[in-house]
Interface confidence: low
């Protein structure tokens, strides 16, 4: 329903704390270079204004849209052009074009230093001094580095952060309490970020219909006892929530997400028997819990899918009568029977089914033509199953670091033109799929592996879009989202690539590597590995292993030496020579 003042409505619905957090996230995601203090000042001004509108909805400017109010605030920032260049041109536009312009200038890879965690004592001191400011910094730092982070979920992670600090800062050994807990939150938040970015990509590139199909499949897997009308309603609501967040309408998004959680908890009887535990939690935890709730038990007496979608004499009539509804019910019926498939696979099967009906329903004898469609799904199902088996076997054999290296070699060969930092980041992320998914029960592996890989590859595509360098990557990124992962998997060595000439300085290391944390050491070694492959794209696994073992031995020896600098400067050139010989 229409409210006289949108900002007063949202302030009342969300409450001051969440309102301020969401406005801070919105500003940080739009203007990613501004400091926390600059944004905090704007947030306070917006909040004070919202309060005047709550007191009197007819007060000046209270009837303006949120985009107008927020956009005017952003455009009033001093030195906008100096700091943000052409983004300042957005301010010459009117709404809604101005907001669209801001969205287009969001940077998926801002040149900001990595978010460093202060040491435990310092962190606890500043948290105790001012918890609100401390959490504000957290929201600001995460939001500016992840401009599409799902805002209500970021509030949830901030709440987790807060709870961990409250607990651990009271302990004697703060460090050993904080580190594993905060590492866990960071890992989950990073996965959440790439998953949400994938949803926004789906929405931006292929529209609401594509996202809604994704939602129908996902919800049908989770709630196999809900009827199609219920699933459609949930998918429609979820699509609206995600559209708002992806579009920068964070207050509406958080408000609608809370409404959806409320609806689900009020209607458990027609949705799922597994919701009660989630529904007993407070708002942010409840919505988070519902988003990853375990699958309900599948109904025991589901008829074979073929009855309605292959054997029924009226398949073509039903399809012609209401294509989207018919295909929607196919996706629903197939997905609720297959919690063991990835959403990407389910969408590929629905696409195959649609293509089959398009072709067959135009023929003289449609049933004879579409009668084999379910059998034709087999290769589409086998391909990701084999991918999971092969990769999980490799992960179990090599461990996470070794598995990342194997992926790095594979992807550098597929797309050697891509920058080394991007390849290393992608390989490290892709390699984490082993730890994340390969330890799960058999029936959960495929959805975990493929949907996670798809989200990581979406990031590869976004980074590549900025500076396209590889025909291979462009080809895979231009197709539909669900075909991307199979496309990347099918890529082989890029035969058009002219190998990089060997530069000794690329493989020259200094004693400072010895004091780096393990993760940074790994990145240095992986950078060298990618450069080796770029130099010799057709090097065998054995050759690369020989060189990398030699390299590891060299680091180990020199980092243990009394005079590290001398060791690096004398042994380094010998290593380079041996590498060249091994790869010759």
């Amino acid at each position: 329903e229409a409210h006289k003042s949108e900002i007063a409505h949202r302030y009342n619905d969300l409450g001051e704390q969440h309102f301020k957090g969401l406005v801070l996230i919105a500003f940080s995601q739009y203007l990613q270079k501004c400091s926390y203090d600059e944004h905090a000042k704007l947030v306070q001004e917006v909040t004070d204004f919202a309060k005047t509108c709550v007191a009197d909805e007819s007060a000046a400017n209270c009837d303006k849209s949120l985009h107008t109010l927020f956009g005017d605030k952003l455009c009033a920032i001093p030195n906008l052009r100096e700091n943000y260049g052409e983004l300042a041109d957005c301010c010459t536009k009117q709404e809604p074009e101005r907001n669209e312009c801001f969205l287009q200038h969001k940077d998926d890879n801002p040149s900001l230093p990595p978010f460093e965690r202060p040491e435990a004592e310092a962190m606890c001191t500043s948290f105790k001094e001012n918890p609100t400011t401390f959490m504000g910094h957290y929201l600001h730092e995460v939001a500016r580095r992840h401009p599409y982070f799902y805002a209500p979920e970021l509030l949830y992670y901030a709440e987790q952060y807060n709870e961990i600090l409250t607990q651990c800062c009271a302990e004697a050994d703060k460090e050993s309490c904080l580190t594993p807990k905060l590492d866990g939150v960071k890992e989950k938040a990073l996965v959440s970020s790439v998953r949400q970015r994938m949803k926004c990509s789906s929405m931006q590139k292929f529209g609401e219909r594509a996202f809604k199909a994704w939602a129908v499949a996902r919800l049908s897997q989770t709630f196999p006892n809900a009827d199609f009308a219920e699933i459609t309603k949930l998918a429609t609501d979820l699509t609206k929530v995600n559209k708002e967040c992806c579009h920068g309408d964070l207050l509406e998004c958080a408000d609608d997400r809370a409404e959806l959680a409320k609806y689900m908890c009020e209607n458990q009887a027609t949705i799922s028997s597994k919701l009660q535990t989630c529904c007993d939690k407070p708002l942010l935890k409840k919505a988070h819990c519902l988003s990853e709730v375990e699958h309900d038990t599948m109904p025991a007496d589901l008829p074979a899918i073929a009855a309605d979608f292959v054997e029924d004499q009226e398949v073509c009539k039903n399809y012609a009568e209401a294509k989207d509804v018919f295909l929607g019910t196919f996706l629903y019926e197939y997905s609720r029977r297959h919690p063991d498939y990835s959403v990407s696979l389910l969408l590929r099967l629905a696409k195959k089914y649609e293509a089959t009906l398009e072709k067959c329903c135009a023929e003289a004898n449609p049933p004879a033509c579409y009668g084999t469609v379910l059998a034709e799904f087999q290769p589409l199902v086998e391909e990701p199953k084999n991918l999971v088996k092969t990769n999980c076997d490799l992960y179990e054999k090599l461990g996470e670091y070794g598995f990342q290296n194997a992926i790095l070699v594979r992807y550098t060969q597929k797309a050697p033109q891509v920058s080394t930092p991007t390849l290393v980041e992608a390989a490290r992320n892709l390699g984490r799929v082993g730890t994340k998914c390969c330890t799960l029960p058999e029936d959960q592996r495929l959805p975990c592996v493929e949907d996670y890989l798809s989200a990581i590859l979406n990031r590869v595509c976004l980074l590549h879009e900025k500076t396209p360098v590889s025909e291979h990557v462009t080809k895979c990124c231009s197709g539909s989202l669900v075909e991307r992962r199979p496309c990347f998997s099918a890529l082989t060595v890029d035969e058009t690539y002219v190998p990089k000439e060997f530069k000794a300085e690329t493989f020259t290391f200094h004693s400072d590597i010895c004091t780096l944390p393990e993760k940074e050491k790994q990145i240095k070694k992986q950078t060298a590995l990618a450069e080796l492959v770029k130099h010799k794209p057709k090097a065998t696994a054995e050759q690369l292993k020989t060189v990398m073992d030699d390299f590891a031995q060299f680091l180990d020896t020199c980092c243990k030496a009394a005079d590290k600098d001398t060791c690096f400067s004398t042994e380094g050139p010998n290593l380079v020579t041996r590498c060249k010989d091994a790869l010759a």
């Epitope: 199609f228 009308a229 219920e230 309605d308 009226e314 039903n318 009568e321 209401a322 509804v325 019910t329």
Partner: nanobody, 128 residues
């Protein structure tokens, strides 16, 4: 013959939510479109919402779109009407109705007319 029994109607405040249930007994529930209708004092009975026999398609009168939601539980032979953000003008006796399918597909939209079986009704009063 299908017997229908509505429940869940009561007095509520404006903007509250309410959920009506309609339990069906008798002939096979699955082969019926199910609808909700309402009649305000001194007015004609009007269509509110309907769901087709497989629960695959729904239809709503414009004034309730986005506020009311119809669903069915085939196993329990029950149809529900979830009513959110209620307004005083939603005050009426709400009737559940069923109509036998006649050759339309499981994807056909449910009808707004031609309902043969009716419940006794349940009173919903929304005070401002």
């Amino acid at each position: 013959q299908v017997q229908l029994q509505e429940s869940g109607g009561r007095l509520v405040q404006a903007e509250d939510s309410l959920r009506l249930s309609c339990a069906a007994s008798g002939r096979t529930f699955v082969s019926y479109d199910m609808g909700w209708f309402r009649q305000a004092p001194g007015k004609e009975r009007e269509f509110v919402a309907a769901i087709n026999w497989r629960g695959y398609t729904t239809d709503y009168v414009d004034s309730v779109k986005g506020r009311f939601f119809i669903s069915r539980d085939i196993a329990k032979s029950t149809v529900y009407l979830q009513m959110n953000n209620l307004k005083p003008e939603d005050t009426a006796v709400y009737y559940c109705a069923a109509r036998q399918m006649s050759g339309s597909s499981r994807y056909s939209p449910p009808g707004r007319v031609g309902y043969d079986f009716w419940g006794q009704g349940t009173q919903v009063t929304v005070s401002s």
